[in-house]
């Protein structure tokens, strides 16, 4: 039974040209995390793997930095970066936990950070839902 919850930075906004930290935290489970994937809609942004460390997708290398921790820093934001981001925690023995963050990139200086929210264990994605994600990243 999956008992964990993922806390994320929730709905956030940032200014065009600025940077933002995407952060998730898995808690309330003693499952051990073996890999964390960061995805934007259907694109893989980055992987933090227990054995191999961080891997940033080539198309995002210039604008994505690993950390802090298991989080991800997006730099030189554009309006096209607006959208959903997912942190996907691969754990043993629980399986996969997924957290969602919505980022809105604004032209003006009205950007504000939204409140944190929690995604309960019910928001769960099986590895089979993502057949092409993260394959070949573990050794």
């Amino acid at each position: 039974m999956m008992t964990g919850t993922i806390e994320t930075t929730g709905n956030i906004s940032a200014e065009k040209g600025g940077s933002i930290i995407l952060q998730c935290h898995l808690s309330s489970t003693t499952a051990q995390v073996t890999q964390v994937n960061w995805e934007q809609q259907d694109q893989l942004l980055a992987i933090c793997n227990a054995d191999l460390g961080w891997h940033i997708s080539p198309s995002f290398k210039d604008r994505v930095a690993p950390g802090p921790g298991l989080g991800l820093t997006l730099q030189s934001l554009t309006v096209n970066d607006t959208g959903e981001y997912f942190c996907i925690y691969h754990t043993y023995p629980d399986g996969t936990y997924t957290g969602r963050i919505f980022l809105e990139v604004l032209e003006s200086s009205v950007a504000e950070h939204g409140a944190r929210f929690q995604i309960p264990t019910g928001d769960y994605k099986d590895d089979d839902d993502k057949p092409n994600k993260g394959s070949g990243t573990t050794s």
Epitope: S27, Q32, T34, V36, C48, D51, P68, G69, H90
Partner: antibody
């Protein structure tokens, strides 16, 4: 150079409390998970507490659960272990140890601080 | 809890000897998802903190001499010192980091014959 320096050990009576500290330097403390591991006199090693990089997760073995609390202050590069309701069997050298994210072995250890629980 | 059993508990050896220490776990330490064995080996000298030697069962930590090697998978693991040096006389511990609570073997003391 990575350095972990424990302090706060000493003699305490059964049922008493003690707070251990670990000062970290030479690395980005907030990017690492941390644990406390103890070693009773002449005995082996026993892991007693874990805290994640941001302090969101803490785990304990049953032997100390409910009595020990691990915490950290990333702004001060410091790790703590609050020990309550101490027992004679808690007598040990207590080490703080660093863990790389997603790896759960201990890659650096402090020199240890001695806790003696005795009346 | 996963029990870790080391053998022998102590051994006497001479400089230049090949030394083998075994560690058995009560359940498999192999993760199928990444094919990694979650086992580490440490060396501890009297009055000193433990020092990491090997992780993932067979990966040598940076700076550890090549005479130290780890092997094994699943539940059976071995630490080998190919040619014992004077500075290698110490206590050696295995540790599983596969599941909470993380547990250590009882230790193997390597003494001078």
């Amino acid at each position: 150079e990575v350095q972990l320096v424990e302090s706060g050990g000493g003699l305490v009576q059964p049922g008493g409390s003690l707070r251990l500290s670990c000062a970290a330097s030479g690395f980005a403390f907030s990017d690492y998970d941390m644990s406390w591991v103890r070693q009773a006199p002449g005995k082996g090693l026993e892991w007693v507490a874990y805290i994640s990089d941001g302090g969101y997760n803490t785990y304990y073995p049953d032997t100390v659960k409910g009595r020990f609390t691990i915490s950290r202050d990333n702004a001060k590069n410091s790790l703590y272990l609050q020990m309550n309701s101490l027992r004679a069997e808690d007598t040990a050298v207590y080490y703080c140890a660093r863990q790389i994210l997603l790896r759960y072995y201990f890659d650096y250890w402090g020199q240890g601080t001695t806790v003696t629980v005795s009346s | 809890d996963i029990q870790m059993t080391q053998s022998p508990s102590s051994l006497s050896a001479s400089v230049g000897d090949r030394v083998t220490i075994t560690c058995k776990s009560s359940q498999s330490l192999l993760y199928s998802s990444n094919q990694k064995n979650y086992l580490a080996w440490y060396q501890q000298k009297p009055g000193k903190a433990p020092k990491l030697l090997i992780y993932w069962a067979s990966t040598r930590e940076s700076g550890v001499p090549s005479r130290f090697s780890g092997s094994g998978s699943g539940t059976d693991f071995t630490l080998t010192i190919s040619s014992l040096q004077p500075e290698d006389f110490a206590v050696y511990y295995c540790q599983q980091y596969h599941s909470y609570p993380w547990t250590f073997g009882g230790g193997t003391k390597v003494e001078i014959k």
